[in-house]
């Protein structure tokens, strides 16, 4: 039992996060999704193509990853944006680019941001631009939690398997 | 104890970085390579210096990491680029900077991009510039697969152990 | 069973993050820290709030993560910087932004840079700016090693749990 034979402080720590027992301790949930390049003005995640995969219980639901079992996961995502120069006749307006990984759990009535990256781009005359954003971190997640992404600047995404992706793996 | 009952070379490796003992001698292949700072116009990966290492079967061949056993790996890389302002007499031309991790496998007759990041830089008068790119993700790899990198903008790399690196570890 | 024989409050805490049980109680040290948003001109790491945590031996000392046991760890950090346009009356001076994860070890009498990212920003008239930096890699660390960060541009940090963080986990 957690906390048995431990010093009081160690026992207290052990009790804070009960652990779940997995048969054979061999399952290693992992997922890597890529943005569907056939959907140009949306970001739809796919796991059944190229180098994408769902392993050991990860599943997709409404463009979200479903957490297969409670525990700590490393969650990551990348996007690459590109754009052309603005035309001399048009006004150059700043572009707000952002990418966020969010957690939806019915504990909260809203999506909780887990990972956020942001950039302001000021397109110039005759100046095409490119910008990459990546982030990843470890989070304590619960079975059934939903991981999704929100992106500002979707029309500017460079959709390819190596540039736009979203994944997670159990630690 | 680290190094006990090992061959001399294995014992030497074991002593370099004491490691956690895992029941059943579970192997955890991992590698972290750094860009050789003595090679200014190329990107040569090194594992025998500073904080770089090859563990549990990873090896380096033709500047590529060789995957030691089939499974899921987290693969990552970072580069940092820098440049000076262009001189007033010179024309400022845009610089395309890119860094890619590629897979070469017996399954494919070409290098498959796994991770790509890109940036356009427009050097200005009296304006030195700096740019960092990082990416990483989980991939299903096969024993013998080769992981390599391709970089556009190599002369602009800031080659130090903490700025330019490439690594992978088994999940 | 987790939560059995605990006080109600302890049992409630125990239920907060059910985790996978690993055979032989194999410990999986992990930590995720977030920048304290109440400290605007410094970067203080916190583990007792939002989605931050310290697990299986990680602890925080003098704003550094203490490595609980020798082994290979994946270490990561992110910062997001923002700024307003400079006023027409003021001179626009370039801003050097940098973020570094450092190692302080009894082996070395100084802080060793592990991960470094850098950026030069040139604020323009009426042009607010945003910039994100992320990095992470695998390192061989020794019990008692201290992992800390150094940041240039702290007044410009966008301090929120999803934008500024620092973490590590044992492989």
């Amino acid at each position: 039992l957690p906390g048995v034979g431990l010093t009081p402080s160690a026992a207290q720590t052990a009790r804070q996060h009960p652990k779940m027992h997995l048969a054979h301790s061999t399952l290693k949930p992992a997922a890597h999704l890529i943005g569907d390049p056939s959907k140009q003005n949306s970001l739809l995640w796919r796991a059944n193509t190229d180098r994408a995969f769902l392993q050991d219980g990860f599943s997709l639901s409404n463009n979200s990853l479903l957490v297969p079992t409670s525990g700590i996961y490393f969650v990551y995502s990348q996007v690459v944006f590109s754009g052309k120069a603005y035309s001399p006749k048009a006004t150059s307006s700043p572009l707000y680019l952002a990418h966020e990984v969010q957690l939806f759990s019915s504990q909260y009535p809203f999506h909780v941001p887990l990972l956020s990256s942001q950039k302001m781009v000021y397109p110039g005359l005759q100046e095409p631009w490119l910008h990459s954003m990546y982030h990843g971190a470890a989070f304590q997640l619960t079975q059934g939690d939903q991981l999704s992404t929100h992106t500002d600047g979707i029309p500017h995404l460079v959709l390819s398997p190596s540039t736009v992706f979203f994944g997670a793996f159990a630690l | 104890l680290p190094g006990v009952g090992l061959t001399p070379s294995a014992a030497q490796t074991a002593r370099q970085h004491p490691k956690m003992h895992l029941a059943h001698s579970t192997l955890k292949p991992a590698a972290h390579l750094i860009g050789d700072p003595s090679k200014q116009n190329s990107l040569l990966w090194r594992a025998n210096t500073d904080r770089a290492f090859l563990q549990d079967g990873f090896s380096l061949s033709n500047n590529s990491l060789l995957v030691p056993t089939s499974g899921i790996y987290f693969v990552y890389s970072q580069v940092v680029f820098s440049g000076k302002a262009y001189s007033p007499k010179a024309t400022s031309s845009p610089l395309y900077l890119a860094h890619e991790v590629q897979l070469f496998s017996s399954q494919y007759p070409f290098h498959v991009p796994l991770l790509s990041s890109q940036k356009m830089v427009y050097p200005g008068l009296q304006e030195p510039w700096l740019h960092s790119m990082y990416h990483g993700a989980a991939f299903q790899l096969t024993q013998g697969d080769q992981l390599s990198t391709h970089t556009d903008g190599i002369p602009h790399l800031v080659l130090s152990p903490s700025t330019v690196f490439f690594g992978a570890f088994a999940l | 069973l987790p939560g059995v024989g605990l006080t109600p409050s302890a049992a409630q805490t125990a239920r907060q993050h059910p985790k996978m049980h690993l055979a032989h109680s194999t410990l999986k040290p992990a930590a995720h820290l977030i920048g304290d948003p109440s400290k605007q001109n410094s970067l203080l790491w916190r583990a007792n709030t939002d989605r931050a945590f310290l697990q299986d031996g990680f602890s925080l000392s003098n704003n550094s993560l203490l490595v609980p046991t020798s082994g290979i760890y994946f270490v990561y950090s992110q910062v997001v910087f923002s700024g307003k346009a400079y006023s027409p009356k003021a001179t626009s001076s370039p801003l050097y932004l940098a973020h570094e994860v450092q190692l302080f070890s009894s082996q070395y009498p100084f802080h060793v840079p592990l991960l470094s990212s850098q950026k030069m920003v040139y604020p323009g008239l009426q042009e607010p700016w945003l910039h994100s930096m992320y990095h992470g890699a695998a390192f061989q660390l020794t019990q008692g090693d201290q992992l800390s960060t150094h940041t240039d541009g702290i007044p410009h940090l966008v301090l929120s749990p999803s934008t500024v963080f620092f973490g590590a986990f044992a492989l």
Epitope: M20, A47, S59, S70, Q143 | - | P18
Partner: antibody, heavy 118, light 107 residues
Framework: EVQLVESGGGLVQPGGSLRLSCAAS????????IHWVRQAPGKGLEWVGY????????NYNEKFKGRFTISSDKSKNTAYLQMNSLRAEDTAVYYC???????????WGQGTLVTVSS | DIQMTQSPSSLSASVGDRVTITCRAS??????VAWYQQKPGKAPKLLIY???HRYTGVPSRFSGSGSGTDFTLTISSLQPEDFATYYC?????????FGQGTKVEIK
């Protein structure tokens, strides 16, 4: 030993409501979701949705959203399926199931029969 | 929703026979397929997950294979207790869906 016991089934008129219960034992109730799966007489299996007792997180098959609600009571180690506006085609054996990994229905109750008929 | 189509819908076999049941998904589901066994009046039992991994306690005569859209459950040597209905299930995306079942009867 993991045990799931359903109750609350029976005969109900079209348009009526019914609440099914699933009493769980033999494991930490808050560590796993509870799924509901139904099987019409002589037909295949159909996933209804799940509830996570730890945080009350839910996910439904769109087909059942609005009419069916899945909930749980931690203090009683019991999950519930509230069914409203019942139709003849809802006649089925309703099972609760506990997964190992989320989408793998590893443990099942014995099932409870719901008959919708006038 | 992803449709799972099993074939055959029923088959007759003898003890010791090698039995193969196939399942086709309406779209690629990677390796995210599970197989269940159900006997009359009983709840289903998990046999295989992730296309080819046997669940704890399942006899080695049960094996699964396939990826993408086509999957197979094989019973290498049919035993008396194996006469039942078998269902495939995709666990690639919600709503998780099942095949219509394959009834294995005694010849």
């Amino acid at each position: 030993e993991v045990q799931l016991v359903e109750s609350g089934g029976g005969l109900v008129q079209p348009g009526g409501s019914l609440r099914l219960s699933c009493a769980a034992s033999g494991y930490t109730f808050t560590s796993y979701v509870i799924h509901w799966v139904r099987q019409a007489p002589g037909k295949g299996l159909e996933w209804v949705g799940y509830n996570n007792p730890y945080n009350d997180g839910t996910n439904y098959n769109e087909k059942f959203k609005g009419r069916f609600t899945i909930s749980s009571d931690k203090s009683k180690n019991t999950a519930y399926l509230q069914m409203n506006s019942l139709r003849a085609e809802d006649t089925a054996v309703y099972y609760c199931s506990r997964p190992t990994m989320l989408p793998w229905f590893a443990y099942w109750g014995q099932g409870t029969l719901v008959t919708v008929s006038s | 929703d992803i449709q799972m189509t099993q074939s055959p819908s029923s088959l007759s076999a003898s003890v010791g026979d090698r039995v193969t049941i196939t399942c086709r998904a309406s779209q690629a589901v990677s390796s995210a397929v599970a197989w269940y066994q159900q006997k009359p009046g009983k709840a289903p039992k998990l046999l295989i997950y992730s296309a080819s991994h046997r669940y704890t306690g399942v006899p080695s005569r049960f094996s699964g294979s396939g990826s993408g859209t086509d999957f197979t459950l094989t019973i290498s040597s049919l035993q008396p207790e194996d006469f039942a209905t078998y269902y495939c299930q995709q666990h690639y995306s919600t709503p998780w869906t099942f095949g219509q079942g394959t009834k294995v009867e005694i010849k």
